[in-house]
């Protein structure tokens, strides 16, 4: 067995919406049949879990109903989404992957992807 | 503050069970992996078992894989670790440790001692 | 089982000198799974470096970790009397998750 790799965008640019999405993908050493993908967030040392979804190879992602991600999965390809992003959530996005099952369990880490948020201008009054 | 806290060890004979306990506190417990490690006198660091999450998924080193048995009660912040048919190599000091969400151990009870003798 | 191996076994240095213990895989570990840990008699251990060169919160700059691959190096600076103890490395990207045997760093 080897060590996993997973690889993502350094860098995303979030819509005016708020909405970021980058592809988070792992290079699976083995044959799993259950995976774990979680989006964190690191701000200076500080690393906190935006969201996390298990899945069993072959079907959906599905996160809570209350989480703020959304995400399809293709192989060992995961197109992740994160909605209602503020300027104030600008930061490092790491994508962990565990194969969960069958043993042996693995954990990749990825570099992270920094998502920039910029705030929409708020539209002027018109005049008519 | 995130505290781990072992209770449950104590002088058991060989082939004889014993439960531990850890009682966690100050994070979210379902968010983490939890871990045993155990440290037979005087020798090194061996890492025991795994429950993840939930608890549906486990692993177990080699050593005590089919005499232990890892779970967890995320309602109670709560960790356990069920041995069975106790060996001599068994006693050890039993660490409870939390697996950070980058992986690392980062948090580690006192630990308990477990005496494995006739 | 990925096997780690530390050396040396013990390392016998004064307060002041700089120590530089090794830990060897016999496999490739993704260098964000690496983490060194500190062991004081009586005590538990305690996480120094993780992902093979963040430093753990609260530890001293004089710990720095270095390495990828298959070899990965923990070295401190200047040793303080608090620093003599065992030091492990270990492995947590694939279980089983591995612990390397220890090096003991005393006083010489």
């Known amino acids: 067995c080897k060590a996993m790799h997973v690889a993502q965008p350094a860098v995303v640019l979030a819509s005016s919406r708020g909405i970021a999405s980058f592809v988070c993908e792992y290079a699976s050493p083995g044959k799993a049949t259950e995976v774990r993908v979680t989006v964190l967030r690191q701000a200076d040392s500080q690393v906190t879990e935006v969201c996390a979804a298990t899945y069993m190879m072959g079907n959906e992602l599905t996160f809570l109903d209350d989480s703020i991600c959304t995400g399809t999965s293709s192989g060992n390809q995961v197109n992740l989404t994160i909605q209602g992003l503020r300027a104030m959530d600008t930061g490092l996005y790491i994508c962990k992957v565990e194969l969960m099952y069958p043993p042996p369990y693995y954990l990749g880490i990825g570099n992270g992807t920094q998502i920039y948020v910029i705030d929409p201008e708020p539209c002027p009054d018109s005049d008519f | 503050q995130v505290q781990l806290v072992e209770s449950g060890g104590g002088v058991v004979q060989p082939g004889r069970s014993l439960r531990l306990s850890c009682a966690a506190s100050g994070f979210t417990f379902s968010s983490h992996g939890m871990h045993w490690v155990r440290q037979a006198p005087g020798k090194g660091l061996e890492w025991v078992a795994v429950t993840w999450y939930d608890g549906s998924n486990k692993h177990y080193a080699d050593s005590v894989k089919g005499r232990a048995t890892i779970s967890r009660d995320n309602s109670k912040n709560t960790l356990y670790l069920q041995m069975n048919s106790l060996r001599a190599e068994d006693t050890a000091v039993y660490y409870c440790?939390?697996?950070?969400?980058?992986?690392?151990?980062?948090?580690w009870g006192r630990g308990t001692l477990v005496t494995v003798s006739s | 089982e990925i096997v780690l191996t530390q050396s040396p076994g013990t390392l016998s240095l004064s307060p002041g000198e700089r120590a530089t213990l090794s830990c060897r895989a016999s496999?490739?570990?993704?260098?964000?799974?690496l983490a060194w840990y500190q062991q004081k008699p009586g005590q538990a251990p305690r996480l120094l470096i993780y992902g093979a060169s963040s430093r753990a919160t609260g530890i001293p700059d004089r710990f720095s970790g270095s390495g990828s691959g298959t070899d990965f190096t923990l070295t401190i600076s200047r040793l303080e009397p608090e620093d003599f103890a065992v030091y492990y490395c270990?492995?947590?990207?694939?279980?089983?998750?591995?612990f390397g045997p220890g090096t003991k760093v005393d006083i010489k």
């Open positions: 270990q492995q947590y990207g694939i279980s089983p998750f591995t």
């Open positions: 496999q490739s570990v993704s260098s964000s799974c």
């Open positions: 440790t939390r697996g950070d969400l980058l992986g690392y151990f980062d948090y």
